[in-house]
């Protein structure tokens, strides 16, 4: 699986999850998030050679098409597969609130 | 929606579904498919500027990150959203077989 366990431990050029730390205030302009100050959102990148973690029949077909037609511009792309939520603390005035934001952290990637 | 209705009628540089005809024999080397000889598999391509058909909170956050950090290499990618099956005819010996292959045709795209 092209997940953090594999990708963060290997120098993988092809599609894999990459570490990306986002600071809420500096990178997004979100002053309203109190904790955490930032988080590892991660992202997916790298080429998708034929059959690498193909998501659907279409991505498999497209990968094969690319292999046999190297000049083609159509190819699968490395995108998030599994995402996890992030729990944040913010304040409504003086009152602390805890919220779970869905689909905030990429844990694995796929070729789609 | 970044679907064939919109994308095939507009000269859209950003993420959109593009027409791609695949000939089973010539492009995939699949001699076993009798009919059709080929089909429009289509594919997704084009940049994903901030908020263009963002798929998840993560892709929205990543898009915002990119907007505020233009030098960043992490950005959402244009990939299939809705896929449709394709019905094919092939032969097992002299016996014709009809099969519906799932997820063969891209009908719309998203930034993921």
């Amino acid at each position: 699986a092209l997940d953090t366990n594999y990708c963060f431990r290997n120098l993988e050029e092809n599609c894999c999850v990459r570490p990306l730390y986002i600071d809420f205030r500096q990178d997004l302009g979100w002053k309203w998030v109190h904790e955490p100050k930032g988080y590892y959102a991660n992202f997916c990148s790298g080429p998708c050679p034929y059959l690498r973690s193909a998501d659907t029949t279409h991505s498999t077909v497209l990968g094969l098409y690319n292999t046999l037609n190297p000049e083609a511009s159509a190819s699968p792309c490395c995108v998030p597969q599994d995402l996890e939520p992030l729990t944040i603390l913010y304040y409504v005035g003086r009152t602390p609130k805890v919220e779970q934001l869905s689909n905030m952290v990429v844990k694995s990637c796929k070729c789609s | 929606a970044l679907d064939t209705n919109y994308c095939f009628r507009n000269l859209e540089e950003n993420c959109c579904v593009r027409p791609l005809y695949i000939d089973f024999r010539q492009d995939l080397g699949w001699k076993w498919v009798h009919e059709p000889k080929g089909y429009y598999a289509n594919f997704c391509s084009g940049p994903c500027p901030y908020l263009r058909s963002a798929d998840t909170t993560h892709s929205t956050v990543l898009g915002l990150y990119n907007t505020l950090n233009p030098e960043a290499s992490a950005s959402p990618c244009c990939v299939p959203q809705d896929l449709e099956p394709l019905t094919i005819l092939y032969y097992v010996g002299r016996t014709p077989k009809v099969e519906q292959l799932s997820n063969m045709v891209v009908k719309s795209c998203k930034c993921s």
Epitope: G29, W30, K31, Y91, V92, G93, R94, E99 | T60, L64
Partner: antibody, heavy 120, light 108 residues
């Protein structure tokens, strides 16, 4: 230059519906919490609702809860207020405003306002 | 909900005079959850002071804010003709946000 422009105000009968729009420009829209504040003719200011962009966390004043819906289209830099089951006491000029950054905060930019009149 | 009471309701002064506007909260707001706005007829409110004492960008130095807990003050050191308007205080310590009923500053 930061600009907020409201539209959609109209004369509507009690029980009717209306959707207000606020288009933002001149800043990164998704970075600031957005509010609706209203002002009845000749009266003071009353907070209506807020929404946090992207994560869509929203909150309402008790007087409009269940009748009004605040929403946001991040891609269009647009804030909305869908108002249903309108009452005569909802008659007011409605302003959209952005906060300095926190959820509850001072509001540094306001739109010009749009007038909603609820009357039979 | 936190009730804000402004006084006086109307303040009649001449240009060049000092104006002192008061805002009292029904419960303590701490030291940094109060803002002041100026509103002229037919216009939207304009932020003057936030955090009880910080001037918003572009606001003249003659405007100052002070106070903490339940008692807050907006002071205009020397009134200019364009300062005559309605002034509102706003608290954002607790939900819902509330505003005072306003003080009308008029030319004497």
């Amino acid at each position: 230059d930061v600009q907020l422009v409201e539209s959609g105000g109209d004369l509507v009968k009690p029980g009717g519906s209306l959707r207000l729009t606020c288009v933002a420009s001149g800043y990164t829209f998704s970075s600031n919490v957005m509010h609706w504040v209203r002002q009845a003719p000749g009266k003071g200011l009353q907070w209506v609702a807020y929404v946090i962009p992207i994560v869509d966390i929203a909150y309402y004043a008790d007087s409009v809860k269940g009748r009004f819906t605040i929403s946001i289209d991040n891609s269009k830099n647009t804030l909305y207020l869908q108002m249903n089951s309108l009452k005569t006491e909802d008659t007011a000029t409605y302003y959209c405003a952005r906060t300095l950054g926190l959820v509850l905060d001072a509001m540094d930019y306001w739109g010009q306002g749009t007038l909603v009149t609820v009357s039979s | 909900e936190t009730v804000l009471t402004q006084s006086p309701g109307t303040l009649s002064l001449s240009p060049g005079e000092r104006a002192t506007l008061s805002c009292r909260a029904s419960q303590s707001l701490g030291s940094s959850y109060l803002a002041w706005y100026q509103q002229k007829p037919g216009q939207a409110p304009r932020l003057l002071i936030y955090g009880a004492s910080s001037r918003a960008p572009g606001v003249p130095a003659r405007f100052s804010g002070s106070g903490s807990g339940t008692d807050f003050t907006l002071t205009i050191s020397s009134l200019e003709p364009e300062d005559f308007a309605v002034y509102y205080c706003q608290q954002y310590a607790d939900s819902p946000i509330t505003f005072g009923q306003g003080t009308k500053l008029e030319i004497k």
